[in-house]
């Protein structure tokens, strides 16, 4: 048998979040029923993470010996705490797009350990905001964002922009 | 380690024009508002420019609005100041400062640069 | 323009005692998302300014617990509760409410009695 720090070396983690408890579940992508030391864990799922926090969760199966997989939750800021924004102004709304994603409220995790991911189309943004410029008036475009905090994607949100009439005479 | 450096800091003449850079390293620059904030000979503290994180709004006091332009060039990790019109009350140590949104903080500033408006 | 007074100007300690700087507004600086984006910073000698308080009580990760922030609506106070030597500087209360027309206070200076 191999050890469970083996078999679950690159276990990949995926994080839901409650908007009522305002608490993390973290969901643990493994084929089989997984034990989870300390931490009760239903269905490879660990609930109630606390925003921010770090938590230790020890791995083990009937497949694989000691030593256990120690995992560590990197988990993320609360989801409410970031707002999409179109800060596209009024004046440029014919050609222009711009998207932002706000922080609205401070958090205590590492603000380098984040990611913004914006795809409109074909284009890819590695950024918090993005302006697109020169685009066709009176047509729609969709754009899709995500955010990932230590590259576990945590809140994802698309938005379909209509650019306005082009004026008169163009 | 992250860290902020201003340069460009000089004696001009009234009326004059120049520019500062401040150079980000050790973070995602584009990922941060960045603010110039000064500090007169009396040793008080303005706040003078504002950028978002991807350069598309821009902020100023009434003080400098019309004769200082604050911009970004996210590809070279650096942060300006076109300064023009320049008048002795501009006189100052000007640093940059790093602020995660409008409704965050300045956690990182530079060690700044002064700007000397004498004739 | 939101004015930020601090008092007193220069506060004169002896190590080991508390210290108060005050600062008041000249409106509120409470954002209509209920928030209060006021802020402390401490500028040492020949150093750039640091942040020690966000939202008025909150400390900023490695500041000691004996600097504390309270206040609300336009009065504020920071508080040290024991004066230590490297706390020597100018305190600075700002305001982040009025976005985008922030202001510093004009500085208390913390200083050896």
């Known amino acids: 048998k191999p050890t469970c720090d083996e078999k679950y070396a690159n276990i990949t983690v995926d994080y839901l979040y409650n908007k009522e408890t305002k608490l993390f579940t973290a969901k643990l992508n493994v084929n089989e029923n997984v034990e989870c030391g300390n931490n009760t864990c239903t269905s490879n799922e660990v609930h109630n993470l606390t925003e921010c926090k770090n938590a230790s969760v020890s791995i083990s199966h009937n497949s694989c010996t000691a030593p256990d997989k120690t995992l560590i939750l990197d988990v993320p800021p609360g989801v409410e705490k970031f707002q999409l924004h179109d800060c596209t102004q009024v004046e440029k709304a014919d050609t222009t797009i711009c998207l932002k994603w706000k922080n609205i409220e401070t958090f205590t995790c590492d603000t380098q350990n984040i990611t913004y991911r914006f795809q409109c189309g074909n284009m890819i943004f590695d950024n918090k905001e993005i302006k697109l410029e020169n685009l066709e008036p009176e047509h729609e475009y969709k754009c899709d964002s995500e955010i990932l905090y230590n590259n576990h994607k945590f809140t994802n949100a698309s938005k379909i922009i209509k650019t306005d009439f082009g004026s008169p005479g163009e | 380690e992250v860290q902020l450096v201003e340069s460009g800091g000089d004696l001009v003449k009234p009326g004059g024009s120049l520019k500062l850079s401040c150079a980000a390293s050790?973070?995602?620059?584009?990922?941060?508002?960045m603010s110039w904030v000064r500090q007169t000979p009396e040793k008080r503290l303005e706040w003078v420019a504002y950028?978002?994180?991807?350069?598309?709004?821009?902020y100023y006091p009434d003080t400098v609005k019309g004769r200082f332009t604050i911009s970004r060039d996210n590809a070279k990790n650096t942060l300006y100041l076109q300064m023009s019109s320049l008048k002795s009350e501009d006189t100052a140590m000007y640093y940059c400062?790093?602020?995660?949104?409008?409704?965050?903080?300045?956690?990182?500033w530079g060690a700044g640069t002064t700007v000397t408006v004498s004739s | 323009d939101v004015l930020m007074t601090q008092t007193p100007l220069s506060l004169p300690v002896s190590l080991g005692d508390q210290a108060s700087i005050s600062c008041r507004s000249s409106?509120?600086?409470?954002?209509?998302?209920?928030?209060?984006?006021l802020e402390w910073y401490l500028q040492k000698p020949g150093q750039s300014p640091k942040l020690l308080i966000y939202?008025?009580?909150n400390r900023f990760s490695g500041v000691p617990d004996r600097f504390s922030g309270s206040g609300s609506g336009t009065d504020f106070t920071l508080k040290i509760s024991r004066v230590e030597a490297e706390d020597l500087g100018v305190y600075y209360c700002?305001?982040?409410?009025?976005?985008?027309?922030?202001?510093f206070g004009g500085g208390t200076k913390l200083e050896i009695k």
């Open positions: 050790g973070f995602a620059f584009s990922n941060y508002d």
């Open positions: 409106q509120s600086i409470v954002h209509s998302n209920g928030n209060t984006y």
């Open positions: 939202k008025v009580s």
């Open positions: 700002f305001q982040g409410s009025h976005v985008p027309m922030y202001t």
């Open positions: 400062a790093r602020r995660y949104d409008v409704w965050w903080y300045f956690d990182v």
């Open positions: 950028i978002s994180s991807g350069g598309v709004s821009t």
